[in-house]
């Protein structure tokens, strides 16, 4: 069978037909439909939406659509015993209490089952004590407090502002500092853009708005009770004391009206510098405790949430490939939301829905993709990427043998300024070529390509005339596919012009105000940015599933490997004396990168020349491309993080959202000057260089001629 027999039309025409079928008006309708009530993981409402999506994907024409369920650990507030924080006087009387729920947005006052703001997986507890303000609660913030300012957080309740890093890292840092509770709040400096009104009159966070979110440190484990294995009917579950990643101290989030009341009384040390000041009219004193007049007052937390094993449902749709049905291209995004999910996730789910509809339309006209496309609506992403991870654990043997690529589809927008792409280097050329073929939706770029507007607004820091493409971190459903299984992955969305605030999210993130109206009134009234994101995500899936030769360029991996090796070497060279003392050499790593570069170059030449009409050779070359990402997986995983197995990339140990390159070496070098046993510490650096060099060399050899 020739490779073109999958289609009744020429490949170019197929892509055009697919893209032309995508309609902004449909995305708008789907978004409205998905956001009228809350769809919290583990609730009946989210199960009903799963069944609706299953039914609609079947109608759209997919070959099969199944629900895959798992019983995982989730967390909910106690309905009759609300969580809150008090200021108490010396008699123990509560003189101020934080709010019990957000004021509902206009039109939603009578909606039931809006979960109040809470930190998912917080243990129960009622700690009371003095407050310490810890800025963003980053590793460097605690270094500043403990090492420079000599402030001890042990036995204190810390208050940290949201932003910069994943909230779970903040809680982990606070725990390690000895805190007995954590209060998280949204400071207007991070969640209120100047010159924009608060919701419902604009897209800024009102004072009563609060960011929900999980505070786990799962490190890729999935369900905390069944790490490594699916949470199915016959699963063996750990006891709660052995569960992975649960916080050990109570945590609760608040808005900036309530934060003002706590922070305005703070005494103790002044903030160390201006980077510790937000935008509230408070001194941002670090503490500990309240100032003179209020020094006898304390803060008390009242947390009564419960962890419960609950059933969740993924929707898995299949469009069988005509030529290589055993090769899977996956498009997945989550369905569960904290409340209405106007942006997160339903702006993404609506785009996936329209992509499925378009593929279904082509299929009904007699077309099939060359490779199988799997579509997924994941559950319980907000509770720790649980739905995607459990499904991947259940299907890991199939995925590691057959997985070509995973394209993530969470929120389509976090702004309306320009495109943002994070992906494996294997996909750089695919993304560049695709965006050159798509029209830019941006004002002032009429008639220009998406590539052009993206490059102008978000230029690459290294290569002129090219756009920035970032490393994959985590905090979303690609994690298990990329970091654990080594399946080439990518994500794309429209973003804001706010580089300094990269990991803080948009102002209304995870609040009750993330509604359909937020998107329709303020972010994308014409749904043109949603359409563009649909074209990028859908176009990537189309090419990955339909191109005869996989659209991966291994030479781009060679380029970044050299860049990452240079970067980690320069970090290490900040300690020249120790490198000399302990005979630390990066020669093996640079040699492996050089070999990879040469072998990748030769492979690319062969890729241009081979006989594409020979299905065996074609399959062999494609398999080498498909398995290249897999070759960067170390079966033993990273130290203390067994489910982060990719040697080139891992989520930063200090911020789950950010990607780190050569993470094993990076972590071994981090704060090495403070290690009590330098010989052991530098020994670990050497071991990590060895692992990295071996892995790069081994990956290179998978691209060599097979015999």
């Amino acid at each position: 069978k020739s490779s073109n027999e999958a289609t009744n039309i020429t490949p170019k025409h197929n892509m055009k037909a697919f893209l032309d079928e995508l309609k902004a008006e449909n995305i708008k309708k789907f978004l409205y439909n998905f956001t009228q009530i809350p769809h919290l993981a583990g609730t009946e409402q989210n199960f009903q939406l799963a069944k609706q999506i299953q039914s609609q994907w079947k109608e759209f024409g997919l070959d099969s659509v199944e629900l895959a369920h798992y019983d995982v650990l989730l967390s909910y507030p106690n309905k009759t015993h609300p969580n809150y924080i008090s200021i108490i006087n010396e008699d123990g009387n509560e003189i101020f209490n934080t709010s019990l729920f957000e004021p509902p947005p206009p039109g939603y006052e009578n909606v039931s089952d809006i979960v109040p703001p809470f930190s998912a997986f917080s243990p129960q507890g009622m700690p009371e004590g003095d407050l310490v303000y810890v800025n963003y609660a980053r590793t460097e913030d605690f270094f500043k407090l403990e090492r420079d300012m000599k402030i001890n957080c042990s036995g204190k309740i810390v208050i940290a502002r949201y932003g910069k890093v994943f909230r779970g890292n903040k809680v982990k840092n606070a725990q390690l500092a000895g805190a007995k509770g954590v209060i998280l709040y949204s400071d207007p400096a991070d969640y209120f853009a100047p010159g924009v009104k608060s919701y419902p009159d604009g897209w800024n966070l009102p004072g009563g708005g609060v960011q929900r979110g999980n505070i786990l440190n799962l490190n890729g484990a999935g369900d905390p009770l069944t790490p490594g294995y699916p949470a199915n009917e016959y699963a063996y579950r750990r006891g709660i004391a052995e569960a992975v990643g649960l916080p050990s101290i109570p945590v609760h989030p608040i808005g900036y009206y309530d934060a003002q009341k706590l922070l305005e009384k703070m005494g103790g040390s002044a903030p160390p510098d201006s980077s510790w000041r937000g935008s509230l009219k408070v001194p941002y004193n670090v503490g500990p405790g309240f100032t003179g007049n209020f020094s006898t007052q304390k803060v008390k937390m009242h947390i009564h949430s419960t962890n419960e094993v609950t059933r969740i449902y993924n929707v898995i749709g299949t469009l069988r490939g005509a030529v290589e049905p055993d090769r899977y291209v996956i498009l997945g995004g989550h369905r569960d939301s904290w409340v209405f999910g106007g942006i997160d996730p339903q702006s993404g789910a609506a785009v996936v829905h329209e992509i499925v509809r378009s593929f279904g339309t082509l299929k009904k006209e007699g077309w099939r993709p060359r490779r199988t496309i799997l579509f997924a609506s994941w559950d319980a992403e907000e509770f720790g990427l649980l739905g995607s991870t459990e499904w991947a654990e259940e299907n890991s043997r199939l995925l590691q043998e057959r997985g070509v690529a995973y394209i993530n589809a969470d929120s389509s927008i976090e702004g309306n300024y320009t495109l943002r792409v994070d992906c494996t280097p294997l996909m750089y050329s695919l993304v560049h070529n695709l965006t050159k073929e798509l029209k830019s939706p941006d004002e002032g770029f009429e008639g220009k390509s998406l590539y052009e507007s993206w490059t102008k607004k978000s230029p690459s820091p290294e290569f002129s005339g090219m756009p920035r493409i970032s490393k994959l971190g985590s905090g979303n459903d690609f994690e298990v596919f990329f970091q654990r299984l080594g399946i080439a992955s990518g994500r794309a969305r429209y973003t804001k012009n706010w580089e300094t605030n990269k990991f803080s999210g948009y102002p209304l993130y995870h609040s009750v105000y993330e509604t359909y109206e937020l998107v329709e009134k303020f972010y994308d009234p014409m749904f043109k940015y949603h359409l563009t994101v649909a074209q990028v995500r859908g176009g990537m899936v189309f090419e990955l599933a339909n191109s005869i030769v996989l659209p991966f360029d291994c030479r781009d991996y060679a380029v970044v490997l050299r860049k990452y090796a240079d970067k980690i070497y320069s970090i290490s060279m900040k300690h020249p004396q120790e490198m000399k003392t302990y005979s630390v050499s990066f020669d093996s790593l640079f040699s492996a990168v050089k070999n990879f570069t040469e072998i990748a170059s030769k492979f690319s030449e062969r890729l241009q020349d081979f006989d594409k009409s020979n299905p065996i050779v074609l399959r062999m070359m494609n398999d080498q491309l498909m398995f290249l990402e897999r070759a960067f997986i170390d079966p033993l995983g990273l130290p203390d993080r067994p489910f982060y197995r990719h040697v080139i990339y891992a989520p930063s140990s200090h911020n789950k959202y950010a990607g780190e390159s050569f993470p094993g070496i990076y972590d071994a070098l981090f704060d090495i000057e403070s290690k009590v046993d330098p010989s052991k510490a530098w020994g670990e650096v050497k071991r990590q260089i060895y692992v990295a060099a071996f892995t790069v060399q081994a990956a290179a050899e998978t691209l060599s001629e097979v015999a």
């Epitope: 809150y84 101020f96 209490n97 934080t98 709010s99 019990l100 729920f101 957000e102 004021p103 509902p104 206009p106 006052e109 009102p206 004072g207 009563g208 009206y257």
Partner: nanobody
Framework: EVQLLESGGGVVQPGRSLRLSCAAS????????MHWVRQAPGKGLEWVAV????????YYADSVKGRFTISRDNSKNTLYLQMNSLRPEDTAVYYC????????????????WGQGTTVTVSS
């Protein structure tokens, strides 16, 4: 259109109790802090009590602290004032009022929309 309808006033003897109600309509009651204010004959407005939109916080004027309790039922769009140990100086027209700003709690920034209900404390 915002409407606040107070009821429950009347004539009572000192030391007795009374419960005032205020039925709200025309705005999202659940999203606004609510106040009771009063005006004694021939005097200016006096703030009595405030409750946050969610009921988490309640604050009282010193003159009524320990005797009056403000509460609300968001499912019924109704505000209450339980008045115990009434004194002659509590004689006044009682108004319920809403906060001007969504989700905020301030003792002095409110709007009166109702006609009030009269409380007379006399032996």
């Amino acid at each position: 259109e915002v409407q606040l309808l107070e009821s429950g006033g009347g004539v009572v003897q000192p030391g007795r109790s009374l419960r005032l109600s205020c039925a709200a309509s025309g705005f999202p009651f659940i999203s606004y802090g609510m106040h009771w204010v009063r005006q004694a004959p021939g005097k200016g407005l006096e703030w009595v009590a405030v409750i946050s939109y969610d009921g988490a916080n309640r604050y009282y004027a010193d003159s009524v602290k320990g005797r009056f309790t403000i509460s609300r039922d968001n499912s019924k769009n109704t505000l209450y004032l339980q008045m115990n140990s009434l004194r002659p100086e509590d004689t006044a027209v009682y108004y319920c009022a809403k906060e001007r700003i969504f989700g905020v709690l301030t003792p002095d920034d409110f709007e009166i929309w109702g006609q009030g209900t009269t409380v007379t404390v006399s032996s």
